[in-house]
């Protein structure tokens, strides 16, 4: 199936021109999504082109300034969060990147009523998280890792807790594994759904081994760098989620929540935490061999001014066959009788689909069944639940929104985006306003993408929220490479891929063929997605076909593909790569003698193992950032996976499916190796040891290490990278410059 | 401090048309919405309408659609609001007034401007 | 639309004295959690004077004895001791729906 034709005939063909590297660079081709932030049922606050922030009310189709470019520009802010009474705005200034999703900030606090900044007992700076009450203007906010509390903003702040302590103990924010591997928030505090409780969880890293890095900078001495990081084995934080009454906190102070026994008796994690009332909580806890998670509902005892979480209110997920969930346990989206709830879960077939659980799991009824699945609950309202799956046309790289009427029985399924923009739109994502009235729909290709805004009642298009007219405009004399999605059928195992195809393609020809991977658990490559990238470049300029396809280990095609991979990384994700490029070869377009692949993480494990494999079928290849060793990287990420680093576990498949353990194998390939040097996530350490390993193994290899960059290699780096990539691939195809 | 200052009173002929002005200063005009409110005698106060003044988007009372359009003037931070085929219970006292949006509430008012509809 | 009614029509009170004005909505005025119901004070020959936004929030510079209270459908002003210029009339405003509607004012009265 062709996703996205160029748009060239002959008469045109002079007009047109290829991309250039300068193009993907430079971000000419990118696109905007629009999602609105909702603030009632039928309004919503957006930056406009001019930096002011405008209220939209859809009912009368008004806007309105609530505030202006200038008082934005006045502390230079950069991001805003309006009070749920609407009083006060939140103004945030002076972002400071930590991790993936921490960062720190100033904070100031605007007056709407009489436009004017709140003076006296200001926040203090920076702050490592900020926001309102769900309900009022009270504020919550994590500094120097303590929690501390405002009835109001002008008022004085109440301190919380007392023990937070830079890399020991973290108040209300997650430390490094939590944000990155469990909770991927900046934050781990939530507020009841009044603003009466605020519930948080407080991590002890004490006795966690700390991975130090050195940090160049400007001085005569680097910095270091140090970060307590459990690795795969090491001893792990210590978690306990506590509930403050934020009416009288002085009162009772924060009580702890219990944790399950079942939970407690070996180490475990806490998974989230989901308000249900004001005065019902519910929390999720998984055991540290992550295939037994564990929801527990708790109350609020008024008498003793604590939380009980009996255990009747424990629902038990347990897989057998691989670990517990997808990329993470999903979360319980509850419905207005406050106590059933809906969660996506492996039915008996080994697809995720929604589940009603009214009383126990056992008894759990199944909302959506199908050889396809469930992939995110949106909005679940009196009568209708919002859900987004890849069911249609059976395409797993699609989404598409559905809504179930659950007011009726039988419940009726409707799809509200198959059919809307059908060529164009396959992928999509939504936003709903309170209680569904209005929704918007972002929908990210594989045409240009295009955001929309809809009746929450008639799912009618109310307006074109953005369209990307100047991209579209841009694009025209632009000579698109083609992009097709199609499957393979090998051995069982249905095999995506998506191929990228030079403009000119020409079937009788032969073209290099480059591999694009990630190939991480439950993770997507084939996606019926628009974007014009680095690989979109090498096609339609450097006249490359590119391949990128889901193997075995991969989401949303069932269980049994998924769950291959567990306890053995390293291993299908490789096969099904070469399987595949097998099978292209085959298609007879394909320049055997110019197949190249190339990763980024995850994806360069897979491609460093890929090009030791010993099947003289890559000529080259690049890493970036990879994994060599499991043991090098996150416990929670790594054992989820492949259990336990030990002898009585699975210490034997951690020893073999290292990158080091195949340096003999590199030496009839071309291997660019890159990283930075202050990764954070996947440390510098694995580069390290594969170029330690292929000096040992007297194996040349080239290497390029960005200083002081983390995982992303971002700025002037990701210019260097890509144009050292280029040039890097371009020598091994033969490829002029 | 702001300050709405409205135009003078106007009589007109049923079957008119009247223009009156409203010209804002101690604020910036682009930042405020503007409504406009009427008076009759002795009677309660009935809205007219809003203007957003960054891209002169309206809003009108369905009562007065086709007879009423409010305009803007930038450079001389002044709005307009016009009603057409005037009869005599348009007789009335015209308000502008400035409408914070995110609490729906006109904060400031003009002086008013008399409209008096008479043959 | 919104019919606002106020009551009583007029209220006779002597400084000093506590004044509650009414005003009822013909449907909810609740948007998600907040009420759009304004207050207003109007002197004779005298433009409207905001005094309470969003049912209970004061405007600008106005005094702590006017307090608004109320959701759905009731509403109320409240003065805790009338002073000699608050005798005047009292008008509520919904801003929840287009068109926004006023009451028909409660004129409060030196006894």
């Known amino acids: 199936i062709v996703l996205r034709p160029s748009r060239v005939h002959n008469s045109e063909e002079n007009t047109m021109r290829a991309l250039t590297l300068k193009d993907i660079l430079n971000g000419t081709f990118s696109y905007k999504t629009f999602f609105p932030n909702w603030i009632s049922g039928q309004e919503y606050l957006h930056q406009s082109a001019d930096n002011n922030i405008v209220l939209y009310n859809i009912e009368t189709g008004q806007s309105y300034t609530i505030l202006s470019n200038r008082t934005m520009k006045s502390v230079n802010a950069s991001n805003y969060g309006l009070s749920p009474d609407r009083q006060f705005v939140y103004l945030e200034s002076d972002y400071s990147k930590l991790w993936r999703y921490s960062y720190t900030a100033t904070y100031y606090i605007y007056d709407l009523s009489n436009g004017e900044f709140v003076r006296g007992n200001e926040l203090p700076r920076p702050i490592q998280y900020l926001c309102w009450s769900p309900v009022g203007s009270k504020l919550a906010y994590v500094y120097q890792n303590n929690i501390y509390l405002k009835q109001r903003p002008g008022d004085p702040p109440f301190q919380i807790t007392f023990n937070g302590r830079e890399n020991k103990i973290f108040n209300g924010i997650p430390d490094w594994v939590y944000e990155e591997e469990m909770l991927a928030t900046k934050y781990a505090l939530w507020w009841s759904p009044n603003g009466k409780f605020l519930a948080y969880a407080e991590f002890n890293d004490t006795d966690i081994p700390v991975i130090a890095y050195s940090y160049y900078g400007d001085e005569q001495y680097p910095r270091t760098i140090n970060i307590p990081y459990p690795k795969a084995g090491a001893k792990n934080p210590v978690v306990r989620i506590f509930i403050i009454d934020t009416t009288y906190p002085a009162y009772v102070g924060p009580q702890e929540v219990p944790v399950p026994a079942m939970i407690a008796s070996s180490d475990y994690y806490f998974s989230w935490l989901t308000w249900v009332t004001d005065e019902r909580v519910c929390l999720q806890w998984l055991k540290r061999v992550q295939n037994v998670s564990v929801l527990s509902i708790c109350d609020f005892r008024e008498d003793w001014q604590t939380w009980d979480c009996p255990k009747t209110q424990e629902h038990i997920e347990e897989s057998r066959t691989g670990w517990a969930g997808g990329f993470f346990v999903s979360t319980p989206v509850f419905s207005y009788d406050a106590i059933s709830y809906y969660k996506i879960f492996s039915d008996k077939d080994g697809y995720k689909h929604i589940h009603y659980i009214k009383d126990t799991v056992e008894n759990a009824i199944q909302i959506t069944s199908g050889k396809w699945e469930a992939i995110n609950i949106f909005r679940v309202t009196q009568d209708s639940l919002f859900y987004s799956s890849n069911e249609f046309e059976e395409y797993p790289g699609r989404r598409n929104i559905y809504r179930i009427s659950i007011g009726s029985y039988p419940p009726s399924k409707k799809c509200v985006t198959c059919h809307l923009r059908k060529e164009r739109c396959q992928y999509y994502t939504a936003s709903f306003s309170d209680y569904a009235k209005y929704y918007a729909l972002v929908c990210y290709g594989p045409g240009i993408p295009i955001s929309t805004l809809h009746d929450g009642r008639t799912d009618q298009e109310i307006k074109i929220l953005e369209e990307n007219k100047e991209l579209e405009n841009a694009l025209k004399n632009i000579q698109l490479p083609k992009e097709e999605i199609k499957k393979l059928e090998v051995d069982e195992i249905t095999l995506w891929y998506k191929m990228i195809l030079p403009p000119q393609f020409d079937r009788s020809k032969k073209y290099p063929l480059l591999i694009q991977v990630y190939g991480g658990p439950c993770s997507q490559s084939v996606r019926s997605v628009f974007a014009v990238n680095w690989i979109s470049y090498l096609a339609s300029k450097e006249g490359m076909v590119i391949a990128l396809v889901d193997g075995r280990g991969t989401a949303f095609q069932g269980d049994k593909l998924l769950y291959a991979v567990y306890r053995k990384l390293g291993v299908y994700e490789v096969e099904d790569q070469i399987t595949a490029v097998r099978k292209f070869i085959e298609m007879g377009f394909i320049d055997e003698k110019r197949i190249a692949i190339w990763g980024w993480s995850y994806g360069g494990y897979v491609s460093s193992l890929a090009l030791a494999s010993g099947t003289g079928l890559f000529k080259c290849g690049i890493a970036v950032a990879p994994v060599s060793s499991w043991e090098y990287y996150a416990s929670v990420y790594t054992e989820r996976f492949m259990g336990l680093p030990t002898k009585d576990d699975n210490l034997e498949h951690y020893k073999n499916s290292t990158v080091m353990a195949r340096a003999e194998y590199f030496r009839n390939v071309d291997y660019l190796l890159i990283h930075g040097t202050a990764d954070d996530n996947v440390h510098f350490q694995n580069s390290a040891q594969i170029a330690k390993a292929l000096v040992n193994a007297q194996v040349d290899f080239q290497a390029m290490w960005y200083s002081d960059q983390n995982h992303g290699l971002s700025g002037l780096s990701t210019n260097h990278l890509y144009t050292h990539m280029t040039h890097f691939l371009k020598q091994c195809f033969s490829l002029s410059d | 401090q702001v300050q709405l200052v409205q135009s003078g009173a106007e009589v007109k002929k049923p079957g008119a048309s009247v223009k009156v002005s409203c010209k804002a200063s101690?604020?910036?005009?682009?930042?405020?919405?503007m409504d406009w409110v009427r008076q009759a005698p002795g009677k309660s106060l009935e809205w007219i309408g809003d203007?957003?003044?960054?891209?002169?988007?309206?809003i009108y009372n369905q009562k007065f659609k086709g007879r009423v359009t409010m305009t803007i003037d930038k450079s001389t931070s002044t709005v307009y609001m016009e009603l057409s085929s005037l009869r005599s219970e348009d007789t009335a006292v015209y308000y502008c007034?400035?409408?914070?949006?995110?609490?729906?509430?006109?904060?400031?008012w003009g002086q008013g401007t008399t409209v008096t509809v008479s043959s | 639309e919104i019919v606002l009614t106020q009551s009583p029509a007029t209220l006779s009170l002597s400084p000093g004295e506590r004044a509650t004005l009414s005003c009822r909505a013909s449907?909810?005025?609740?948007?998600?959690?907040?009420?759009?119901i304004n207050w207003f004070q109007q002197k004779p020959g005298q433009a409207p004077r905001l005094l309470i936004y969003?049912?209970?929030n004061r405007g600008s510079g106005i005094p702590a004895r006017f307090s608004g209270s109320g959701s759905g459908t009731d509403f109320t002003l409240t003065i805790s001791s009338l002073e000699p210029e608050d005798f005047a009339v009292y008008f509520c405003q919904q801003s929840n729906e287009v068109p926004y509607t006023f009451g028909g004012g409660t004129k409060v009265e030196i006894k």
């Open positions: 101690g604020y910036t005009l682009t930042d405020y919405n």
């Open positions: 969003g049912t209970s």
């Open positions: 203007i957003y003044p960054n891209t002169g988007g309206t």
């Open positions: 449907e909810s005025v609740d948007n998600y959690g907040l009420s759009f």
């Open positions: 007034t400035r409408f914070r949006g995110i609490h729906y509430a006109m904060d400031y």
